[in-house]
């Protein structure tokens, strides 16, 4: 059987300041069991952008309905974009662990560029 892949189809996204950015991500399988999270940047200093289970992410919404069964669309929208939001965003699949989940596979990343609002 094919191992799960995390697909971020957009290498880059350009968004005007003040607008909403859509970052697309899909998984090719429901298993292994475990959550998807979004980060900006890679490595130990990366910034958590969205985790459905815990935390407060007022600017982030999911593209798909959170109550949808067997969902494999993990795309998100980030509202009120500012130049400080620029960077590379990664959609990361975790394998369920006890007590801590373990990173399983990451998407290739989507670079978000922010165009300044015309004055």
């Amino acid at each position: 059987e094919e191992e799960l892949q995390v697909i971020q189809p957009d290498k880059s996204v350009l968004v005007a300041a003040g607008e909403t950015a859509t970052l697309r991500c899909t998984a090719t399988s429901l298993i292994p069991v475990g959550p998807i999270q979004w980060f900006r940047g890679a490595g130990p200093g990366r910034e958590l952008i969205y985790n459905q289970k815990e935390g407060h992410f007022p600017r982030v919404t999911t593209v798909s309905d959170l109550t949808k069964r067997n969902n494999m669309d993990f795309s998100i929208r980030i509202g009120a974009i500012t130049p400080a939001d620029a960077g590379t965003y990664y959609c990361v699949k975790f394998r369920k662990g006890s007590p801590d989940d373990v990173e399983f596979k990451s998407g290739a990343g989507t670079e978000l560029s922010v165009r300044a609002k015309p004055s």
């Epitope: 298993i31 999911t62 959170l66 069964r69």
Partner: antibody
Framework: DVQLLESGGGVVQPGGSLRLSCAAS????????MTWVRQAPGEGLEWVST??????YYADSVKGRFTISRDNSKNTLYLQMNSLRAEDTAVYYC???????????????WGLGTLVTVSS | EIVLTQSPATLSVSPGERATFSCRAS??????LAWYQQRPGQAPRLLIY???IRETGIPERFSGSGSGTEFTLTITSLQSEDFAVYYC??????????FGGGTKVEIK
């Protein structure tokens, strides 16, 4: 139509072993996590074990004694039960996992169950 | 481990009446809660998931509500086939998946 059919239950002495099977049909078996849940006579439901692809999870009460596995080519789920105890006596149900909220699992289809009795 | 407490343990209701029973979680499970029905001698059947979403084919008289730590299953106008045991299950934090102890709905 989704169908789950358990087999392999029976009477076994304490310390003995048993292997349960669950034959699945009507859905893409390899795409879904699968779970065993048990119910002791007159009692409630107790989660036993879940398997995804290579990932396996166990209740503390069975860890080290039970092994869950699957054969996707045969659409079959297994539960190898070793060092059985009287408190393992229960109806064992095989269930198909369904996912929502990006990670959590509940059980949308259940088999009819197979009875395991551990007694001397 | 998240503990689910169902109450009452037994509910006596006349056919045609409304039945309401609760499931309390020992910690916040957001909306990650399912309800199952188990008739005597049968396997459990999924009724509700995500606290309030009715499974396909489940009659409209079944409804789920609540979030966080307090959840309710309501059956309006009980039918004879609704007399059964009802279990809640959380899938927010696992392993282990945990079930409530069940509520038995019996004929008054």
């Amino acid at each position: 139509d989704v169908q789950l059919l358990e087999s392999g239950g029976g009477v076994v002495q304490p310390g003995g072993s048993l292997r349960l099977s669950c034959a699945a049909s009507g859905f893409s078996f390899s795409n879904f996590a699968m779970t065993w849940v048990r119910q002791a006579p007159g009692e409630g439901l107790e989660w036993v074990s879940t398997i995804g692809s290579g990932d396996t999870y166990y209740a503390d009460s069975v860890k080290g004694r039970f092994t869950i596995s699957r054969d996707n080519s045969k659409n079959t789920l297994y539960l190898q039960m070793n060092s059985l105890r009287a408190e393992d006596t229960a109806v064992y149900y095989c269930a198909k996992d369904s996912t929502v909220s990006w990670s959590g699992d509940f059980f949308d289809y259940w088999g009819l169950g197979t009875l395991v009795t551990v007694s001397s | 481990e998240i503990v689910l407490t169902q109450s009452p343990a037994t509910l006596s209701v006349s056919p045609g009446e409304r039945a309401t029973f609760s499931c309390r979680a020992s910690q916040n499970v957001k909306n990650d809660l399912a309800w199952y029905q188990q008739r005597p001698g049968q396997a459990p059947r999924l009724l509700i998931y995500a606290a309030r979403i009715r499974e396909t084919g489940i009659p409209e008289r079944f409804s789920g509500s609540g979030s966080g730590t307090e959840f309710t299953l309501t059956i309006t106008s009980l039918q004879s086939e609704d007399f059964a045991v009802y279990y809640c299950q959380q899938y927010y934090d696992w392993p282990p998946f945990t079930f409530g102890g069940g509520t038995k709905v019996e004929i008054k």
